[in-house]
């Protein structure tokens, strides 16, 4: 949320909603950090530890299975997106500790804070892809029998990553460093050069493409899936479905504060009390969104324990059990009508 706004007396840091105020500069006169910043630091530290270790473990578990298990491909890509974002955390942490001073240079300013947005778009696009996969397994099992394969899954992931990179470009392009003098520091933020319309456009696109549209489509998608699942009283394990629903729900929960404050700030006058209050909460909103980068491994472990009854297995084998379950789609391309009927019933609960 970091824009250099030309009229704000306090500024943003590193993600991309606020506007660096180039005219009325920062008021950071206390040695002690604000409470929201302290909370953000605590969250960043936890997210980094859990996110790096947890996602590394998920990558390790799923990488071996990705050749043969489509679910492993989905979870592998989600973990890579989260792991990448976590790598920026030590830098962002250091910047907050130094009252948002950015001594890391212009290239780092463009790239590192943009990683969380890349993560946002990559995650939601991958979740949309996974959700489409769940939908097809339930409603088009014969199509899945014929066409659902690892190659197609990897192509879908590549498209998701490509679109995510494309959608992150505005943040990357508008991000600049600038020197501040009272007190002396370098700030990293987004500079919309007085263009409030452009700032609003970026915020609206981010809200719609990164939040509202996915929320609507995925809600509809899972409503259909769950209704079909319950109506068929499927006996098959709903393990993967439950995990995916939990991952999707957590995405929207943790991105909500960031999106709400971002859209509000783009429409508020930078000198307004509400804007200044939201500015102070900026780091906290970013850190809250960053929880997405460590929550998935936690969901997988909790889900694994739930399915096992209690934690009897080692962590890798528990994760493997959750993440690499293959949906009931036969390998053979030749099947009878009865096989299809049986399979259609079995896949209701996927």
């Amino acid at each position: 949320m970091d824009s250099f706004n030309y009229t704000t007396p306090d500024y943003g840091h590193y993600d991309d909603k606020d506007t660096l105020d180039l005219n009325t500069p920062v008021d950071k006169t206390s040695n002690t950090l604000r409470v929201p910043d302290i909370l953000a630091l605590v969250i960043f530290a936890v997210v980094f530890l859990v996110g790096v270790l947890g996602n590394a473990l998920v990558v390790w578990v799923t990488a071996f299975e990705a050749k043969r298990t489509i679910n492993a491909i989905w979870f592998l890509n989600l973990a890579v997106a989260d792991f990448l974002s976590c790598l920026a955390l030590p830098i962002l942490f250091t910047s907050i500790v130094q009252h948002h001073h950015w001594p890391f240079g212009g290239a780092a300013c463009s790239i590192l804070p943009s990683l969380i947005l890349l993560n946002m778009y990559a995650s939601i696009l991958l979740l949309a892809t996974i959700s489409a996969d769940r939908f097809l397994l339930v409603f088009k099992p014969i199509w899945c029998q014929n066409f659902r394969g690892a190659g197609l899954a990897w192509i879908a992931c590549a498209v998701a990553w490509g679109l995510a990179l494309l959608l992150t470009i505005p943040s990357f392009l508008y991000r600049v460093v600038r020197e501040e003098y009272f007190p002396p520091k370098v700030l990293c933020g987004v500079d919309y050069s007085h263009d409030k319309r452009r700032e609003r456009a970026v915020a609206i696109v981010r809200l719609v493409l990164g939040f509202l549209w996915p929320l609507l489509t995925l809600t509809i998608c899972y409503t259909f899936i769950l209704l079909r699942t319950w109506s068929r009283r499927a006996t098959r394990s709903t393990k993967t479905l439950k995990v995916v629903v939990a991952v999707v729900a957590s995405f929207f929960i943790f991105w909500l504060p960031y999106q709400v404050t971002g859209i509000m700030m783009s429409f508020l006058e930078p000198s307004s009390p509400t804007f200044l209050l939201l500015k102070k909460l900026d780091s906290l909103c970013v850190s809250f969104a960053y929880i997405n980068c460590c929550i998935n491994p936690i969901i997988y472990v909790v889900a694994g324990q739930g399915f096992q009854g209690r934690l009897r297995k080692s962590l890798p084998s528990l994760l493997r059990n959750v993440l690499t379950e293959e949906s009931v789609v036969r390998e053979s391309k030749s099947f009878t009508r009865s096989t299809v009927d049986t399979m259609a019933q079995k896949t209701q609960a996927v």
Epitope: P9, L22, N23, T24, P25, V26, D27, K28, T29, S30, N31, R178, E179, Y181, F182, P183, P184
Partner: antibody
Framework: DVQLQESGPGLVKPSQSLSLTCTVT?????????WNWIRQFPGNKLEWMGY???????SYNPSLKSRISITRDTSKNQFFLQFNSVTTEDTAKYYC?????????WGQGTTLTVSS | DIQMTQSPSSLSASLGEKVSLTCRAS??????LSWLQQKPDGSIKRLIY???TLDSGVPKRFSGSRSGSVYSLTISSLESEDFADYYC?????????FGGGTKLEIR
């Protein structure tokens, strides 16, 4: 070594507009830092007026924002302070200074007297 | 705006004497404070920045310190060229403001 030198009209009448010039030698005003105007009133009180940064970004003291403007001529390595309408209250000695970590280099100052 | 209260406003001292000037900030300025020296000809020179860091070329007899919101400039042994006006300046936020000054005179 960085050197700053102010120049101005010296004496002006109230309501007139004027421009003060700061010429910088030994350092490019587009390299880094902020280039400031500060004034000292007859009672010795000092007041920061504003700056133009190396990138051209401008910041003013809110108490003066509507009355002054700071510009620069990078080809001559100069920056300027313009008043649109002076009053007798603007009688002071005007200094230009560089800010990097506080104000590290100062000019000698130029005295401006506003009198009818 | 942050108010910088400087004391004393004037001080008479002898050569070789040790003197201290103080500056109190009305709000936290986190050590973003400079001490400036203004000679009788009007020229201004920075002596100290970041509360206690000596500028290059400034004699070691000058030192800066901080105790809470009170900042001090100490001259350990006065020399003839030290008799001048001294100002503190904070640059912790906008606008930077100056102390009222201390006139250091020879006794």
């Amino acid at each position: 070594d960085v050197q700053l030198q102010e120049s101005g009209p010296g004496l002006v009448k109230p309501s007139q507009s004027l421009s003060l010039t700061c010429t910088v030698t030994g350092y490019s005003i587009t390299s880094d830092s902020a280039w400031n105007w500060i004034r000292q009133f007859p009672g010795n009180k000092l007041e920061w007026m504003g700056y133009i940064s190396y990138s051209g970004r401008i910041s003013y003291n809110p108490s003066l924002k509507s009355r002054i403007s700071i510009t620069r001529d990078t080809s001559k390595n100069q920056f300027f302070l313009q008043f649109n309408s002076v009053t007798t209250e603007d009688t002071a000695k005007y200094y230009c200074a560089r800010a990097s970590i506080g104000f590290d280099y100062w000019g000698q100052g130029t005295t401006l007297t506003v009198s009818s | 705006d942050i108010q910088m209260t400087q004391s004393p406003s004037s001080l008479s001292a002898s050569l070789g004497e040790k003197v201290s000037l103080t500056c109190r900030a009305s709000q936290e300025i986190s050590g973003y404070l400079s001490w400036l020296q203004q000679k009788p000809d009007g020229s201004i020179k920075r002596l100290i920045y970041a509360a206690s860091t000596l500028d290059s070329g400034v004699p070691k007899r000058f030192s800066g310190s901080r105790s809470g919101s009170v900042y001090s400039l100490t001259i350990s042994s006065l020399e003839s060229e030290d008799f001048a006006d001294y100002y503190c300046l904070h640059y912790a936020n906008y606008p930077p403001t100056f102390g009222g000054g201390t006139k250091l005179e020879i006794r």
